[in-house]
Interface confidence: low
Amino acid sequence: SERCDDWGLDTMRQIQVFEDEPARIKCPLFEHFLKFNYSTAHSAGLTLIWYWTRQDRDLEEPINFRLPENRISKEKDVLWFRPTLLNDTGNYTCMLRNTTYCSKVAFPLEVVQKDSCFNSPMKLPVHKLYIEYGIQRITCPNVDGYFPSSVKPTITWYMGCYKIQNFNNVIPEGMNLSFLIAFISNNGNYTCVVTYPENGRTFHLTRTLTVKVVGSPKNAVPPVIHSPNDHVVYEKEPGEELLIPCTVYFSFLMDSRNEVWWTIDGKKPDDIPIDVTINESISHSRTEDETRTQILSIKKVTSEDLKRSYVCHARSAKGEVAKAATVKQKVPAPRYTVELACGFGAT
């Protein structure tokens, strides 16, 4: 058939691989676009075809599977590079077809260089460790399928540029790196280099991830409202600007949604017929505890507005809290008028 279901360029799968290392790339059709797997497609007589467009070119070319030492090969729904070269960068297309059916998708592949300390343009996954929480582990990612279980690779772990050996609280254990107890000083980039033999050659897989030490769930508390509080009274005259900050501290909680909002007379500000604006700012501590500030602002407050109830609310996975601001209308100071009598002294 002439027609082909073209899923276009799948930029969600921006694949980055290191130069001079093996890479195995699965055709995204079976993972994200079609409801059947490669085995089913193959059994049904469908053929998977690969081609590519070089960087800064428009011309689609077949992939050369006849390179020395089978540098590029295909196995089922996987395209293999053993190893990659810089000029392998480009858009790769996998197409599944027979005489009556066709479906294809393209995806970008970027081959990147790393320096001697593993720095590179590679986007790094972030792994969060709880501070002072006991033993926690990170695992060397994305190495499955590169070698059979009968092959025993050597794995070397680095922090930054340095091989991890004789570190006080960090212990390499094969594919895992164990943190006996995590501190802020453990923040940084950790790299595992997996070395394995294949057909008389030695290959390296380099995987770097960023470790971020965050607040421990043991120390997590419900949101704490620092402002408004009982010590501050917002006393204004009609016509003045009313500014009330709601400042809330949130303990770090993995995957928790932190929310702060104001109510005025029990309603959302949008539902009140007054000209109110709310500006939010967010800051984080070194362990990713969060402080959110929402400043409620009424440019020209009326005496009616000064009688309303202004309540700051906060919610996290640990609970919900609320605190009312004390808002008052300023009592005008008495005006002393001196009336001059006719005489000053007693007559």
Epitope: D115, S116, C117, F118, N119, T156, Y158, M159, G160, C161, Y162, K163, Q165, N166, F167, S185, G188, V193, T195, T202, H204
Partner: antibody, heavy 120, light 110 residues
Framework: EVQLVESGGALVQPGGSLRLSCIVS????????ITWFRQAPGKGLEWVAT???????YYASWAKSRFTISTDTSKNTLFLQMDSLRAEDTAVYYC??????????????WGPGTLVTVSS | QIVLTQSPATLSASVGDRVTITCQAS??????LAWYQQKPGKAPKLLIY???TLPSGVPSRFSGSGSGTEFTLTISSLQPDDSATYYC????????????FGQGTKLEIK
């Protein structure tokens, strides 16, 4: 363009102390691992110590007790404190960027060196 | 402790010659070897890393090969500017390394 420049070399008496500095211009020092090497007159290169800022320090076995490597990341400066100096410590001292440790570590950037002479 | 042994210690060759310097490691260091060039009164300059990779700016007449324990630096066509001392350096073992370098090879132009 990153540059390394050593300073602090001088003539010092045996038993004396000296502090060498290595200023790194360009990106933050904390992004790099810096190593001190030395080269005695007419001799080969000898590793002294390496620092991975905020992570760890490494010393040649002979340097451990007398030399201390440190950094001031705010000033982008690396230091080598040398105590109980001996005549055999006379050498040109180099700082270099890079590290030891993986199968392709190399020192890709070197300072011009600073001369330390230990003599009475 | 890994020891690197370079040979020859000194070498004299003519402009245009093909020159080879070898470096032997006392135990296998995979491809963890770098080569440096040093001219009198100057700092060393990185020529080759990862046994055979040239950094940018290094002339293509320099090449490196080998893995395990035997390594070679080759200058395909010697130039007058190549007169220098050449050092190999292992980047395999960190920690308590007494000396990461070979003893050097002095190359003179005839």
């Amino acid at each position: 363009e990153v540059q390394l420049v050593e300073s602090g070399g001088a003539l010092v008496q045996p038993g004396g102390s000296l502090r060498l500095s290595c200023i790194v211009s360009g990106p933050s020092l904390s992004h790099f691992d810096i190593t001190w090497f030395r080269q005695a007159p007419g001799k080969g290169l000898e590793w002294v110590a390496t620092i991975s800022p905020g992570v760890s320090t490494y010393y040649a076995s002979w340097a451990k007790s007398r030399f201390t490597i440190s950094t001031d990341t705010s000033k982008n400066t690396l230091f080598l404190q040398m105590d109980s100096l001996r005549a055999e410590d006379t050498a040109v001292y180099y700082c270099a960027r890079g590290g030891v440790g993986s199968s392709w570590k190399a020192f890709d950037l070197w300072g011009p060196g600073t001369l330390v002479t230990v003599s009475s | 402790q890994i020891v690197l042994t370079q040979s020859p210690a000194t070498l004299s060759a003519s402009v245009g010659d093909r020159v080879t310097i070898t470096c032997q490691a006392s135990e296998s260091i995979s491809t963890a070897l770098a080569w440096y060039q040093q001219k009198p009164g100057k700092a060393p300059k990185l020529l080759i890393y990862k046994a055979s990779t040239l950094p940018s700016g290094v002339p293509s007449r320099f090449s490196g090969s080998g893995s395990g324990t035997e390594f070679t630096l080759t200058i395909s066509s010697l130039q007058p500017d190549d007169s220098a001392t050449y050092y190999c350096q292992q980047g395999f073992s960190s920690g308590n390394v007494h000396n990461a370098f070979g003893q050097g090879t002095k190359l003179e132009i005839k």
